[in-house]
Amino acid sequence: MNGRVDYLVTEEEINLTRGPSGLGFNIVGGTDQQYVSNDSGIYVSRIKENGAAALDGRLQEGDKILSVNGQDLKNLLHQDAVDLFRNAGYAVSLRVQHRLQVQNGPIGHRGEGDPSG
């Protein structure tokens, strides 16, 4: 029997300071180019080496960005979302959603080191 895959979804506020070359990440998504089926949200597709986001360490590829400086990213065209980031100023507050994959063992099986039982 295979284990099922679950996801642990958490939200975090990440405050970044724009570096010499910017914030240091790429995004995908938007109402005109959905990255996830039936979801027009904005997702992080790349963290640039030595950029502000990479040096901070909290933002991860695959994270969904919910808001920038308190402004909701729902129902935005891709380019409008990009422009929002580019005009966000020196100190940028991101509300992000992390989606962590959790592998559960088969039902009835207790993994090694499980303290219960």
Epitope: G22, N26, H78
Partner: nanobody, 127 residues
Framework: HVQLVESGGGLVQAGASLRLSCAAS????????MAWFRQAPGKEREFVAE????????WYSDSVKGRFTISRDNAKNTVYLQMNNLKPEDTAVYYC?????????????????????WGQGTQVTVS
Amino acid sequence: HVQLVESGGGLVQAGASLRLSCAASGGTFSSYAMAWFRQAPGKEREFVAEDSWSNHRVWYSDSVKGRFTISRDNAKNTVYLQMNNLKPEDTAVYYCAADRDYSGSTVDPPNQSEYDYWGQGTQVTVS
């Protein structure tokens, strides 16, 4: 490794048009973001326009928006910069640049440090 060769520069009068070409070799052209930068005498190199084929995006600097058009022909491994209504302040050496096309759009203004490959440049002089 990508090699880039620009052509099409020259001396023109204000209000005229020019089309620059940049021929690429040595890589899978469609997998690169292509851009034009320029450097005027005594000034820093500045971004002009960028075309990312895989991400369907085109960017322009405010100073050329509405006058310049970047386009590419993947079959010919060439990127173009059509420059209309040229002004004396457009006088510069124009450089073609290429960078591996990553997924998605950068949230940062295009920056020359992002680009790995550069041509030798072509001179545009507007009198």
